[in-house]
Interface confidence: low
Amino acid sequence: DAHKSEVAHRFKDLGEENFKALVLIAFAQYLQQCPFEDHVKLVNEVTEFAKTCVADESAENCDKSLHTLFGDKLCTVATLRETYGEMADCCAKQEPERNECFLQHKDDNPNLPRLVRPEVDVMCTAFHDNEETFLKKYLYEIARRHPYFYAPELLFFAKRYKAAFTECCQAADKAACLLPKLDELRDEGKASSAKQRLKCASLQKFGERAFKAWAVARLSQRFPKAEFAEVSKLVTDLTKVHTECCHGDLLECADDRADLAKYICENQDSISSKLKECCEKPLLEKSHCIAEVENDEMPADLPSLAADFVESKDVCKNYAEAKDVFLGMFLYEYARRHPDYSVVLLLRLAKTYETTLEKCCAAADPHECYAKVFDEFKPLVEEPQNLIKQNCELFEQLGEYKFQNALLVRYTKKVPQVSTPTLVEVSRNLGKVGSKCCKHPEAKRMPCAEDYLSVVLNQLCVLHEKTPVSDRVTKCCTESLVNRRPCFSALEVDETYVPKEFNAETFTFHADICTLSEKERQIKKQTALVELVKHKPKATKEQLKAVMDDFAAFVEKCCKADDKETCFAEEGKKLVAASQAALGL
């Protein structure tokens, strides 16, 4: 339904508080280097303008599209050329090309300082002095570092952030109350950002059909009692929501997400029995809860799939009449019966089924040709099952840190051209699959593990896309969304790689390592491990283990020494020499 003024419509639907927060997120995700104060000023100007349109929808410029209004506002930033370089050229374009141009300049790895957490008393004082500014700053800092963060979900994080400070700044032991909550929000926030980044990559790189297929599979697993028509409606609406958010249309996205949550709750009887509690919550919590809701129980006595999709004489007729609908029904029926499969596996099975029908429906005897199609699924199902079994055994044997190290070595040998920080970040996250998923029973392991790995490998893909250095990474990232993980798994050691020159500076450590947190210290050691492999890609596990054990002992010894700096200088030289000898460098 058309509105005379889109900005007035969204302001009224969302309310002033959410409107301002979402505009701030949108601006910070586009202009990631701009100071906080500049963004607040722009947001206030947009908000004042929106209010004039609410008062009179016919007022000047109120009929303009949100992209036009927001783009015009962003293009008033005086330092656009100096700060952003060629992004300033976007401002010479007309809509919709201007918005597309801004989107293309979003930076997944912006050159911004690491967020350092101040002392608890300092944070509490800032919170009490100006709660509104404090919370806006949170939105701004997260949004500019995560330019694809799911905006309505960021509002939910901000609400929890506020709740944590409201409670803990009154507590007897503020730090004991607040710090675990902030750690939890940080970790959940990173996970949420990565999950949304995969959704946007799916839409932007592989198109709406790929996203819809993913959504059909996931929603069918989650809502197995819902009819196919109901799942299809939810998929259409969910696709619209994520297309909007990934496209920078955050006001429309938040508004449509609220409508979708409302629809789901009004129709929960025909969707899922697990939604009751979610639907009693306020909007932000409700939407979050629905997105995370557990799978409903499968209906009893579901018939065999073979009847409709293999044995029926009408398979080719049904397929020809409406290919995507028929494949959607196949995916729906398979997914609702298999909450134990990962979404990407279900999509591989659907792709295999599609390929078989394309081939067989043109054959002389179609039925004879596709009669054994389900047999083709067996190896596809067994591959992730075996891989997860092996890796969970390795994780249980090694523990998280050493399991991460094993993956670091494995992935550095596969794609040694990738930057060391990216290899460390991605391998650490890949290693977290162990503690996240291996504790689950068999029936939950695969959806947990393989769908999580899809999210992590997407991080590698988007970081690599910014500075491509490896044809193998490009190939695995671009050829097939659902086969990314099998593609990376299948990579062997890169025999074409020329080892890096040895540089002693890379392995020089100082006393500052002693004051780092355990996590930061691990990252230092893992960085050294990646560099070692880049110098000596043919080093054996045993050789690398010996060097890393020596390195750990060296750090521990020097951190206990009276004169730490001297110890690091002298013992460090010895360690480098011993490591060179051990690895034959």
């Epitope: 609400k159 929890r160 709740a163 944590a164 409201t166 409670e167 109350c177 009693e280 919550k281 919590e285």
Partner: nanobody, 115 residues
């Protein structure tokens, strides 16, 4: 460990009033929902009234205009003012508080409306 304690129940004549209170002890943060549920003999649990973090309220059709829910954020307290009580309101009334970490219930307080 969070504990909820209800008070204020009792025997009252039709047309009378009662005020139920529920207090939360222990560490509870980020509350987004406080509510009162009731269970009459031989019946299921039904939501009577709820109040969200922004103060918006929701009432069962059977109590609209007679019952009022309110909360005191600073004390983690939730109240239910019940006026014009009817025999059909006889039930055990339970307090429910939800936060980001979980869903907490009290033991219940008996309300009996009888002449």
């Amino acid at each position: 460990q969070v504990q909820l304690v209800e008070s204020g129940g009792g025997l009252v004549q039709p047309g009378g009033s009662l005020r139920l209170s529920c207090s939360a002890s222990g560490s509870i943060w980020g509350i987004y929902h406080m509510g009162w549920y009731r269970q009459a003999p031989g019946k299921g649990l039904e939501l009577v009234a709820s109040i969200t973090v922004d103060g918006s309220t929701h009432y069962a059709d059977t109590v609209k205009g007679r019952f009022t829910i309110s909360r005191d954020n600073s004390k983690n307290m939730v109240y239910l003012q019940m006026n014009s009580l009817e025999p059909e309101d006889t039930a055990v009334y339970y307090c429910d508080i939800r936060n980001v970490g979980g869903d907490y219930w009290g033991q219940g307080t008996q309300v009996t409306v009888s002449s």
